[in-house]
Every structure is written in C-alpha cells, then in structure tokens.
C-alpha cells in the first residue's frame, strides 16, 4: 500500500523563490511523518525535510544548504524555497514517510516538478542607459 503524490509538472522561480506543493492521497492529521524534497533525476540531494509530530511544532530543516520553509495541510506539505540559483534548475521530487502510528507507509515515486530558476534581470539605470540601437 503506497501513498500517491501529486506535484505541478513545472514551476518557474522568477525571483529566485518558489512554493512547491506536494499533495498526498493520505491525511497527515495526528500522524508522525517525514516529508522531504529531493533534487535530481536520481533524487541524490535532499533539499529540505519537514518532520511532523502529533504533539510538537513542525520541524523544518535543510542539511544541504538550501533556504527552505515548510507548511502543513491535512493532505499536503508545501515547501517554500528561497535564494535559488539559476544552476539549481532541475527536477524536484516530493517524498513522504509516515512512521506512526503503524503501519509504515511511503509513496510511489511521483513524476516530479521541474523548477526553472530565472535569474534576476537587472534593469538598466536611467543614468547609464544600455547601448542604443543604431
């Protein structure tokens, strides 16, 4: 028995930040779980982790240097990533493990979300206009 995960196929981070919502076919209310976001086709980089516990505040952290936050819904976890770099454009996968109460459950691998990070476009200053067209 596996949890199904739905993600947007593609998101664009215009200002180097993005909200990625992971929607689950499972109600997380009163469960102890570990939701995580992984970068790359092989999910090699664990971008962000959200620990949910029935009795404690949500714990959100990244061990890989990403600036992330997380919000919990009954059947979703939303990861808010900031300060993304253009070279972090990649496919990102949501993962969920429900530990307590038993039985342990995890998810079928989702299709992932391509996050396209657009660099900040610096507008030319009026005092120093860009090169004019001939």
């Amino acid at each position: 028995n596996k949890i199904l995960v739905k993600q947007s196929p593609m998101l664009v981070a215009y200002d180097n930040a993005v909200n990625l919502s992971c929607k689950y076919s499972y109600n997380l209310f009163s469960r102890e779980f570990r939701a995580s976001l992984h970068k790359g086709l092989d999910s090699a980089v664990e971008v962000c982790v959200v620990y949910g516990n029935y009795s404690q505040q949500l714990q959100v952290y990244s061990k890989t240097g990403f600036n992330c936050d997380g919000k919990l819904g009954n059947e979703s976890v939303t990861f808010y990533l900031q300060n993304l770099y253009v070279n972090q454009t990649d496919i990102y996968f949501c993962k969920i493990e429900v530990m307590y109460p038993p039985p342990y459950l995890d998810n079928e691998k989702s299709n992932g979300t391509i996050i396209h990070v657009k660099g900040k476009h610096l507008c030319p200053s009026p005092l120093f206009p860009g090169p004019s067209k001939p």
Partner: antibody, heavy 120, light 111 residues
Framework: EVQLVESGGGLVQPGGSLRLSCAAS??????????VSWIRQAPGKGLEWIGE???????YYSPSLKSRVTISRDNSKNTLYLQLNSLRAEDTAVYYC????????????WGQGTLVTVSS | DIQLTQSPSSLSASVGDRVTITCRAS??????????LHWYQQKPGKAPKLLIY???SLQSGVPSRFSGSGSGTDFTLTISSLQPEDFATYYC?????????FGQGTKVEIK
C-alpha cells in the same frame, strides 16, 4: 535465518564516545518492510528505546537522547551503527539491536547484546 | 510520551498456577482496530523474546499457554499453567507513538 550480532562494547571513560555495530544477516537493512532499533538496559533495570532506522535511511530518536545519539548504517556490510557521545555513568547498560516489521512494529528478532561500562 | 504501568512488579507462583500480568497505558494505543501493544519475556543474561504482538497474537513458536488480551489502555498477559521455564521477567511495549516505551517489568519468581 535472521540474526543480529552486536559488537563494540567495553569500558569507556566518562565524557567519551561509543560506536557500536550490529551486523544483520538473513535480511537486508535497505529492503522495504523492516527496520531496526537500538534498545538498552541498565544493570538490574528495565528496557529503554534509543532510536531506530528505516529501510530508507530515515532515523527517529528518543527525545531524551536525541542530542547525543546518531544511528547510521553501511548497506554494503548490512551493518547498523550506534554512536553515543558525552557518555556518563548512567549510560552503562547492555545495548541491543532489534528488528521490527512495518506492520505492527513489534521486535521479533534481537541481538545478544553488548555491555558498555562508563567509568573512570 | 506514553507511559506503561505494569502490575504487579513481582509475583511468586508455583508450577501449574495461572498467572496474570496487567499493563496499563497512559493513553489509548489503538489505531484502526489494532492495539499496538506487545509482550516480551526476558531471562537473566539473555535478550528479550517476543511472546505476543498486537495485544493478542501469539508469536510463532511460543507455547499456547501464553495469551494476551485487552484494548485501548488496559492489557493482560496470561500464562494458563506456569512451567519451570516461565520464571522470568515480562515486559509490555507500545509502538503506537514514538518514543516507543516499555513497562517497568514484572518478575515472576518461584514460590
């Protein structure tokens, strides 16, 4: 046949660290369906759960020990490890690893245990 | 944390006696009709051995004189006819929530 064999116990100085091993055979630590916990028992006392590791590598720890404990594994050796830091006399105990299945989480197989004595 | 309180802490009994040990949880350990409460036997110098899982299911290879019952917060381990090899310490354990917790143990001694 499922077997768990702990090693690495002995005499440790207060303030020191310990690293215990639990070699598993008869099942794979990285295959879905089973996880392994560390449990300890001080001399003449009851059983205390330390923490656990799932097939995915995710870990869960007892809040009372969380700041001092790390559970890890080496899939190539099918071996589990327990690292406990800043040891004190109260950490003197027999340390067991025990396997659980994902449905009920009961401990169906246990190692023989390894004794750790914290003393100067 | 879920506290488990066993009673009695120790008891003296004779071979052939019916022995009952109780375990009370500080909150329900039931979920979807399953009680996540297990019983173990431990002999001196040995690792614990699983006897009963999910409150009432007998672990493979365990003699049928051992039985478990209960749900919610109140559980019982019964040995219908005590045998010489049953003198040991018995523990209950819950796996409903983390941290997993054990009862303090009940020592069954020879009268």
């Amino acid at each position: 046949e499922v077997q768990l064999v702990e090693s690495g116990g002995g005499l440790v100085q207060p303030g020191g660290s310990l690293r215990l091993s639990c070699a598993a055979s008869g099942f794979s630590l990285s295959t879905g369906g089973v996880g392994v916990s560390w449990i300890r028992q001080a001399p003449g006392k009851g059983l205390e759960w330390i923490g656990e590791i799932y097939h995915s590598g995710s870990t869960y720890y007892s809040p009372s020990l969380k700041s001092r404990v790390t559970i890890s594994r080496d899939n190539s050796k099918n071996t589990l490890y327990l690292q406990l830091n800043s040891l004190r006399a109260e950490d003197t105990a027999v340390y067991y690893c025990a396997r659980y299945e994902y449905y009920h989480y009961d401990f169906d197989y246990w190692g023989q245990g390894t004794l750790v004595t914290v003393s100067s | 944390d879920i506290q488990l309180t066993q009673s009695p802490s120790s008891l003296s009994a004779s071979v052939g006696d019916r022995v009952t040990i109780t375990c009370r949880a500080s909150q329900s350990v039931d979920f979807h009709g399953i009680s996540f409460l297990h019983w173990y036997q431990q002999k001196p110098g040995k690792a614990p051995k699983l006897l009963i899982y999910a409150a009432s299911s007998l672990q493979s290879g365990v003699p049928s004189r051992f039985s478990g019952s209960g749900s919610g917060t109140d559980f019982t381990l019964t040995i219908s006819s005590l045998q010489p090899e049953d003198f040991a310490t018995y523990y209950c354990q819950q796996s409903y929530r983390s941290p997993r917790t054990f009862g303090q143990g009940t020592k069954v001694e020879i009268k």
